[in-house]
């Protein structure tokens, strides 16, 4: 029988033993930076090279012993997740492990950056295919391997880390919050969020998604045909770093933006129960589990999206909070959220040569967040063209006035502290799309961009009395680029994609003695490329 | 050669205490700073540091990543690391575990 | 390139013990284990276990009921197979291989048991 | 222990044949099923893996096919040095076991 954890992350179509071919990812390379490992385990012989790199500190304690199955213990389970012949992800996928754990888990920060100069000077020294780095380990916040890390990325190399067994938010590790790095939380075969004793996995808006990492079987250390079970954030990320084998070995070219992106667009969605998070992390938690594509050849008509969320801004008056897109991602759209509903809006900046999304602070509020829509649109101009508040009773209004540029998202942003209620009589007059409309005390900040085969069109979804959520999603066959609220008052804590669907939230009515009159619009913007659709038909 | 004028070198440290290894630092120059002048700046570090008597060990020096050198050495030493050419940061070393 | 060299042939009494040898080179010791075949005169091919040179480590056959013994010296790149209590139906070419996969082999070891 | 059964034992064949030799296993072993061919006087040598894998340097006229329980190794156009015996053995289970073999002749 097909243990659960593969079972879930094929595609429903498929049963697992067929659609893991033996073959699967033998154009790739993957790297574990982990403890020693028994390589002539029967599930792992002949897949992984144990290379001469060793940096590890002494093991604590004076009474240690060092026993060689234990020590080989974590890394041989994860190198037989990955690339197992019978229980591993990417049957067909090579490995090269590198020691950087000591036998009790443990091993240091500039022992593993040594470890990732090693990867990197192997490549200069040997290019081969795609490399894709696994990192099952985890420290504290570290500056120095993030931007490690980062470098390493931007080398064309794809970083995989686990997102930390401490229940707590990712963002205070390392690697898991290096923003190139991909980082995986764990759930059950119930779809959950693992438990681990009295922690369990991380979560927060620096993981990316979730993979299984519970009762994992992999191969165990204690002989050479053995099994264990296994669990652990470890075990979630070689679920994904195998899935990336995959899916580099059917389309070698991808890079690490795109893989991210289908990474996301094939995870399964909204399966896990964010009751288990804290509450002030739910939102920011993606709510997806990780699953193979279901068909090797690619998705390359896809437009693809995803919501970045920005750090929390603080509580000060003028504390602002930024949201940034991977490098060869456009930043399609910007909108924010705060708790408290105080906040003054957001706007699209060039930050660097890059549009970047900065969401504002108001006086007594929380802090906010900035959430980016990012997105791959290859060939893309993007512009963002700005109104000042028009004071007039019609609102502020703003649209794509240039030839070929469509219409991606809206953003607005406000001085006043506090915006009064304020119902357009007329959201959008028919027949002009391309526009964004907003309170009169608000700049109002279009998106605007020209792509080949690109086209848009506006989706609201209006509640007349206040309702907490208010959502709009696109059709199959749509991505939601764009997400933002109508009218921008006092009452609407803010807006945010989920997937496909945009998010408007409000403050609690019971609370608040709100009126009729405070209507909320969730707008989408819903975006498509014929010119990526033709171009996958073509390579077909 | 002093440091760029109006760029301060940084410090920083896991902010987990239990998991902070004080004695070993990683200096991090800026970024394009070539593998000689990293190699010259950690030399430099360790004249400096012998003449205020203090023994230090250059335990790596890095390339191909970023540049920067390894370092063993006392905590008391850090603020004439911070001051010596092309130092961008440095953050003190500190332990990572199996997840 | 991968090899696998054999020990000479051996004849040996019934009762007595043999230990045949198989030198690996061309390849990551450590990354595969040896298998031990052997091939009694013409029959077919039959697995009697499998030695670690990462840790010494074996997995035998049922059948050799405590007769055989693996080793490897990873010094030399070397594994050994010892059978005690030979019997006239040990007699058979001894071939190791390499790892479970068994994707190369050595060129086999004739032993014969006979009084 | 699973049993491997090899058909026929042994045929004859002329050069340019098209070859089939068949090996059925007692229980599933998925895919997990070796083809080595051993000529007299040598080593057996590892032709097909995982059912239908060809290693590095072993001609494209070998193939082999199927899963489960039931397996093909097929010679698309026989040679003179492709005439020796073939064993198939199921690599799923631990004591691998062998196919009492099959003897390719010529005709």
């Known amino acids: 029988s097909i243990p659960w954890n593969l079972e879930r992350i094929t595609p429903p179509r498929y049963r697992a033993d067929e659609y893991q071919p033996p073959d699967g990812g033998s154009l790739v390379e993957v790297y574990l930076l982990d403890t020693s490992i028994q390589s002539d385990h029967r599930e792992i012989e002949g897949r992984v090279m144990v290379t001469d790199f060793e940096n590890v500190p002494e093991e604590d304690g004076t009474r240690f012993h060092r026993q060689a199955s234990k020590c080989d213990s974590h890394g041989t389970h994860l190198a037989g997740v990955v690339s197992g012949r019978d229980a591993g992800v990417a049957k067909g996928a090579s490995m090269r492990s590198l020691r950087v754990l000591n036998c009790q888990g443990k091993g240091t920060v500039s022992g593993t950056l040594i470890g990732l100069e090693f990867i990197r000077k192997s490549q200069l020294v040997q290019p081969v295919g795609p490399l894709v780095v696994l990192l099952p380990l985890a420290g504290g916040y570290s500056r120095v391997l993030n931007a490690a890390c980062q470098r390493l990325a931007r080398a064309g190399v794809v970083l995989v880390t686990a997102a930390g067994n401490f229940r707590d938010d990712a963002c205070l590790y390392s690697p898991a919050s290096a923003p190139e790095v991909i980082t995986v939380g764990a759930t059950n075969a119930q779809d959950q969020p693992v438990t681990l004793g009295t922690l369990g996995t991380n979560f927060g808006r620096c993981v990316d998604l979730f993979a299984p990492g519970e009762d994992i079987i992999g191969a165990s250390s204690d002989c050479s045909t053995c099994f264990v079970s296994q669990s652990g954030t470890s075990q979630a990320a070689a679920h994904v770093a195998g899935i990336a084998a995959m899916m580099l070995s059917a389309e070698p070219e991808l890079t690490l933006a795109e893989l991210r992106q289908r990474l996301i667009h094939f995870s399964a969605k909204d399966v896990i129960n964010e009751a288990w998070f804290p509450e002030d992390q739910r939102v920011l938690t993606p709510n997806l589990v990780a699953a193979l594509p279901p068909s090797t050849h690619g998705a390359g008509w896809q437009l693809f999206c995803r919501t970045v969320w920005s750090a929390h801004s603080g509580p000060t008056r003028m504390a602002t909070a930024i949201a940034r897109c991977a490098p060869d991602e456009e930043l399609l759209s910007c909108s924010s959220f705060s708790r408290s509903g105080k906040r003054r809006g957001e706007r699209m900046e060039a930050q660097g040569g890059k549009l970047v999304c900065r969401a504002h602070n108001a006086f007594g509020g929380e802090g906010v967040y900035a959430i980016a829509r990012c997105c791959l649109l290859p060939q893309a101009n993007c512009s963002v063209h700005t109104a000042p508040p028009a004071e007039a009773s019609m609102g502020t209004r703003v649209h794509c006035h240039q030839q070929g540029h469509v219409l991606t998202g809206c953003s607005s942003h406000w001085e006043v502290e506090d915006l009064g209620t304020h119902k357009p009589p007329v959201l959008r007059p028919r027949g002009q799309p391309n526009q964004c409309v907003g309170h009169r005390e608000a700049s109002i900040h279009a998106s605007c961009c020209h792509a080949p085969g690109l086209e848009c069109k506006v989706k609201e979804h209006g509640i007349p009395a206040p309702q907490e959520q208010v959502t709009v999603a696109c059709e199959e066959g749509w991505t939601l680029t764009g997400c933002s609220a109508l009218p921008g008052t006092s009452h609407v804590l803010g807006a945010y994609a989920v997937d496909n669907t945009c998010v408007v939230r409000s403050r609690d009515v019971s609370t608040t003695g709100s009126t009729s009159e405070e209507a909320v619009t969730a707008v989408a913007i819903c975006c498509r490329s014929r010119h990526l659709a033709q171009a996958s038909q073509e390579l077909q | 050669e002093a440091p760029e004028h109006g760029t301060t070198a940084t410090f920083h440290r896991c902010a987990k205490d239990p998991w902070r290894l004080p004695g070993t630092y990683v200096v991090v120059l800026k970024e394009e700073t070539h593998l000689s002048q990293s190699e010259r700046t950690a030399r430099r570090l360790q004249a400096q540091a012998a003449r205020r008597g203090y023994l230090t060990k250059i335990l790596h020096v890095f390339h191909g990543l970023l540049p920067g050198f390894l370092v063993k050495m006392s905590g008391d030493l850090l603020e004439l690391a911070l001051k010596l050419p092309h130092v961008d940061y440095i953050e003190e070393d500190s332990s990572v575990f199996a997840q | 390139q991968v090899q696998l060299v054999q020990s000479g042939a051996e004849v040996k009494k019934p009762g007595a013990s043999v230990k045949v040898s198989c030198k690996a080179s061309?390849?990551?010791?450590?990354?595969?284990?040896i298998s031990w075949v052997r091939q009694a005169p013409g029959q077919g091919l039959e697995w009697m276990g499998w030695?670690?040179?990462?840790?010494?480590?074996?997995n035998y056959a049922q059948k050799l009921q405590g007769r055989g013994t693996m080793t490897t010296d990873p010094s030399t790149s070397t594994a050994y197979m010892e059978l005690r209590s030979l019997r006239s139906d040990d007699t058979a070419v001894y071939y190791c291989?390499?790892?479970?996969?068994?994707?190369?082999w050595g060129q086999g070891t004739t032993v014969t048991v006979s009084s | 222990d699973i049993q491997m059964t090899q058909s026929p034992s042994s045929l004859s064949a002329s050069v340019g044949d098209r070859v089939t030799i068949t090996c059925r296993a007692s229980?599933?072993?998925?895919?997990?099923l070796d083809w080595y061919q051993q000529k007299p006087g040598k080593a057996p040598k590892l032709l097909i893996y995982?059912?239908?894998t060809r290693p590095s340097g072993v001609p494209s006229r070998f193939s082999g096919s199927g899963s489960g329980t039931d397996f093909t190794l097929t010679i698309s156009s026989l040679q003179p040095e492709d005439f020796a015996t073939y064993y198939c053995?199921?690599?799923?289970?631990?004591?691998?076991?062998f196919g009492q073999g099959t003897k390719v002749e010529i005709k």
């Open positions: 291989a390499r790892g479970y996969v068994m994707d190369f």
């Open positions: 061309g390849y990551a010791i450590y990354n595969y284990g």
């Open positions: 030695v670690s040179f990462y840790n010494g480590n074996t």
């Open positions: 229980q599933s072993i998925n895919n997990w």
């Open positions: 995982a059912a239908s």
């Open positions: 053995q199921q690599d799923q289970d631990i004591p691998p076991t």
